[in-house]
């Protein structure tokens, strides 16, 4: 057999025996000569190129580059491959020989005592068991044991080759101590030495590099980079790093095995690089490769020098940010600088803190967004080394879709009168304030439900054939009044009115306000009834913790069984063929409340008394009267709403004030509250009487001083006082000139 | 100051009949509304007729109905409660009551001022 590729100038050593396979018995002579054109040397099995006392190799008497092997009384433990070679070169003629040995029939390995085997659990992996025979057609069998297993050449995974050995699927003996090869000759077993099991694992799970990735430093830092092989059990890692600067000077890699828990089904091996002071020649890719010989895993990660610490902003930094109410606002702070930069936002000049609505970090997140939220942020990046620092405005505008006050005051099923005039309102608001406001109307009876329209609590009206008011035919006489624009509760809005100059027919109304993000409508259900009606006693608007009562009153001839009830808190579940009224045909929605029946000649009177009245009070409640004759039932709904308790406040400040002798002084004193405070004046914390130079109007709160004198000069104190406690304002007046002196003669 | 005087309260068989009077002082009866309430012990108290401003409307709890009835005298400035047929549960401390012009006082809440009340005893 030849080995390697001829040379053009060299042909291959030539064997006295020209087979690739030789068999002789043992106890015989073997002798090979091998020609050749230069420089010759031979190798043998078991010692590969030593020097073996009986193997003999020596020069031949007839010519040049030619050697002659020979081994006296070869034993089995000869056989394998004899090979004869060029110096330097690949070239090589190869004969494989058999020596026949039936007392030994397996070659033996040099220590003679016992090998090893490495195996890995992998299922498609096979292991080699290196018993090789000398003889090259035996019957061998493998053994493992404990417990005691013998495998059986099958033609396919297991089989056994004499210049190999015995090969198997490693898994089918990981579980085995040892393993020997057993040969049957004539009835008579014959064993090779025993190999040792060693299982090796091979899985590499996961190879992590730390840091991961945006590694930054500037010249003459320190890098270190630890890379973590994760493996199973019986694993050895070779670590291999590739980096920029090869040939590096401060260049320190240490390997190690890191400790893991007892139990553990895992292996950690540690490798890290370290570059004392690094140069702009360092930057580039790292990549850490770790092998286990049967696996390689690798990662990588850019590693960033720069010349000096700095910082800026990036190029996609905004300037405006446009958000609508109750969206999730984000503003990253978008740079470039190193080391990253501590950052710090600003609101109209005052600093930022987290919280659970915003989160003012790298970017500045507010949860849910809100109009007061509108306004100028700005972010200051400050470098942590050369304490460089910029900064940047964005503009934050918050729009508001239409929102219609009412909707949250007043309840879909009010009812009316018939034949009185109504005034329904949309009160507005949104940012930017409603490019239109419109108003459309339907009858009643065309929106009562149809079994196949689908109706929700959020959406009880299923009506789609909206009229615009300009269209009242067979509705009501109607007249949209101009938008008015007003200040209410510190917010501009736009305030749109509908006047219906008769109640004569129930119908539904819908404004709906628009603006760039959005649309908001209110559909007010206008029922008009002949039937009870209710009054609120004393008041329209209790405040909480005084009494109110209601009273609804039915002339008795028509109606009987007055009944007041009130809404459950949850809106009115809608179900088929409710409306109009859905209030009266689902009692199950209404709670029945005590009260207390009077009648006079015509009316009957049942008052529902609410003492102390409650927050919790506050609702729709159902008047509920059965007509005699037919037993319809007819509701009327009133809404009721408690204010609550405010203490005392005062608006704007009382200015202290200089004021010459004989001119006027006019003060007003603001107070707001519930229940309305009252306003009383002091003048150096004495109670200010009315005479004809002090007049106080509009429940005090003007005061006007009338032709003012010296003795007027003073600390002058406006209180504002309710059950829930007082506020007070003070200023002082002073007189100038000289007091006239009155002529009495 | 405003003072409201009953009197005519007594003891008296079931089915027997009283006459309260509440004279007012200091307060007009023909230009306000006025009631007549009553406690009975250990239950609220409660309306049981009312009168509006100038006499013209007369209101009753649906218990006094038919037997009790309301009246005033603008002249004497007093307000009556004619009582017959009465009931052992018509037994109560009976309040006269002053409201506004309207609506009269049929409960508290519309109650200005109260009188001291009258014992009325009604055995069976």
């Known amino acids: 057999a030849s080995v390697g590729l001829p040379s053009v100038s060299l042909d291959l050593p030539r064997l006295s025996i020209q087979k690739d396979i030789l068999t002789i018995k043992a106890n015989t002579t073997l002798q090979i000569t091998c020609r050749g054109q230069r420089d010759l040397d031979w190798l043998w099995p078991n010692n590969q190129s030593g020097s073996e006392q009986r193997v003999e190799v020596t020069e031949c008497s007839d010519g040049l580059f030619c050697k002659t092997l020979t081994i006296p009384k070869v034993i089995g433990n000869d056989t394998g491959a004899y090979k004869c070679f060029y110096r330097e070169t690949d070239l090589a003629s190869v004969i494989y020989v058999y020596v026949q040995d039936y007392r030994s029939p397996f070659i033996a390995s040099v220590s003679d005592q016992h090998g090893v085997v490495y195996i890995t659990e992998n299922k498609n992996k096979t292991v080699v068991i290196p018993c090789l025979g000398s003889i090259s057609n035996l019957n061998v069998s493998l053994c493992a044991r404990y417990p005691e297993k013998r495998f059986v050449p099958d033609g396919n995974r297991i089989s056994w080759d004499s210049k190999k050995g015995f090969t198997i699927p490693s898994y089918m003996i990981s579980y085995a101590g040892m393993v020997f090869c057993e040969a049957k000759i004539n009835d008579e077993s014959y064993q090779s030495i025993m190999y040792i099991v060693v299982v090796v694992g091979y899985r590499i799970y996961d190879v992590v590099l730390s840091p991961s990735h945006g590694i930054e430093l500037s010249v003459g830092e320190k890098l270190v980079l630890n890379c973590t092989a994760r493996t199973e059990l019986n694993v050895g890692i070779d670590f291999n790093w590739e980096y920029p600067s090869s040939k590096h000077q401060h260049k320190k890699l240490v390997n190690r095995d890191l400790k893991t828990q007892s139990g553990s089904e895992m292996k950690k091996f540690l490798s890290t690089l370290t570059i004392d002071g690094v140069t702009r020649s360092d930057q580039g890719l790292y990549t850490c490769a770790a092998s286990s010989g049967l696996m390689t895993k690798k990662n990588s990660t850019f590693v960033r020098v720069h010349e000096k610490p700095f910082v800026a902003f990036g190029s996609g930094m905004e300037s405006l940010v446009e958000a609508t109410v109750g969206e999730r606002v984000r503003i990253p702070a978008k740079y470039l600088g190193y080391p990253p930069p501590e950052i710090k936002w600003y609101k109209n000049g005052i600093p930022l803190e987290s919280n659970h609505t915003i989160k003012a970090g790298h970017v500045l997140t507010i949860m849910e967004v809100s109009e007061r939220d509108t306004g100028n942020y700005t972010v200051i990046l400050t470098n942590p080394i050369s304490k460089e620092k910029q900064s940047h405005v964005v503009s934050l505008v918050v729009y508001v879709p239409p929102q219609i006050g009412e909707k949250s005051l007043i309840s879909p099923v009010d009812s009316y009168q018939y034949g009185t005039t109504q005034t329904l309102t949309c009160t507005v608001y949104a940012i930017p304030p409603p490019h239109h406001i419109h108003w459309y109307w339907q009858l009643e009876e065309e929106c009562a439900n149809e079994p196949s329209q689908a109706v929700s609590v959020t959406n009880p009206y299923p009506c789609e054939e909206w009229r615009s008011v300009e269209d009242f035919q067979g509705g009501n006489k109607i007249e949209v009044n101009k938008n008015q624009f007003a200040l209410i509760e510190g917010k501009n809005k736009t305030v749109s009115t509908l006047v219906i100059q008769a109640a004569n027919v129930s119908a539904l109304y819908k404004c709906e306000a628009v603006n760039k993000v959005g649309r908001g409508e209110r559909v007010i259900s206008f029922h008009v009834t002949r039937g009870p009606e209710i009054t609120l006693q004393p008041d329209m608007q209790p405040t909480e913790q005084e009494s109110v009562s209601l009273w609804c009153t039915a002339d008795r001839s028509t109606f009987e069984n007055l009944t007041w009830y009130k809404l459950g808190p949850q809106p009115l579940p809608i179900h088929v063929g409710e409306l109009p009224t859905p209030v009266c045909k689902n009692l199950d929605t209404l709670w029945k409340l005590n009260a207390t029946m009077f009648s006079n000649s015509t009316n009957d009177i049942l008052i529902m008394e609410l003492k102390n009245a409650s927050l919790q009070d506050q609702g729709d409640y159902v008047c509920l009267a059965q007509d005699r004759k037919t037993k319809k039932r007819h509701c009327v709904v009133r809404q009721l709403t408690v204010l609550e308790r405010v203490a005392p406040t005062i608006t704007g400040n009382l200015e202290n004030q200089t004021t010459s002798i004989g001119e006027s002084i006019e003060v007003s004193c603001t107070a707001s509250g519930n229940p309305p405070p009252q306003i009383m004046w002091f003048k150096d914390n004495e109670t200010l009487v009315e005479d004809s130079g002090i007049v106080l109007k509009d429940g005090n709160r003007n005061l006007t001083i009338r032709r003012v004198r010296k003795e007027d000069e003073g600390l002058y104190t406006c209180q504002a006082c309710s059950v829930l406690g007082c506020a007070k304002v003070e200023a002082f007046f002073i007189i100038e000139g000289a007091q006239e002196k009155t002529n009495l003669e | 100051q405003v003072q409201l005087q009953e009197s005519g309260g007594g003891s008296v068989q079931a089915g027997g009949s009283l006459r309260l009077s509440c004279v007012a002082s200091?307060?007009?009866?023909?230009?306000?509304?006025m009631g007549w309430f009553r406690q009975a012990p250990g239950k609220e108290r409660e309306g049981v007729a009312g009168?509006?401003?100038?006499?013209?409307?007369?209101y009753y709890a649906n218990s006094v109905k038919g037997r009790f009835t309301i009246s005033q005298d603008n002249a004497r400035n007093t307000v009556y409660l004619q009582m017959n047929t009465l009931k052992p549960e018509d037994t109560a401390i009976y309040y006269c009551?002053?409201?506004?012009?309207?609506?009269?006082?049929?409960?508290?809440?519309?109650?200005?001022?109260w009188g001291q009340g009258t014992q009325v005893t009604v055995s069976s």
């Open positions: 009168i509006n401003e100038g006499g013209t409307a007369t």
């Open positions: 200091g307060y007009s009866v023909s230009k306000n509304s």
């Open positions: 009551a002053a409201g506004s012009p309207d609506p009269p006082p049929l409960i508290e809440s519309v109650v200005k001022y």
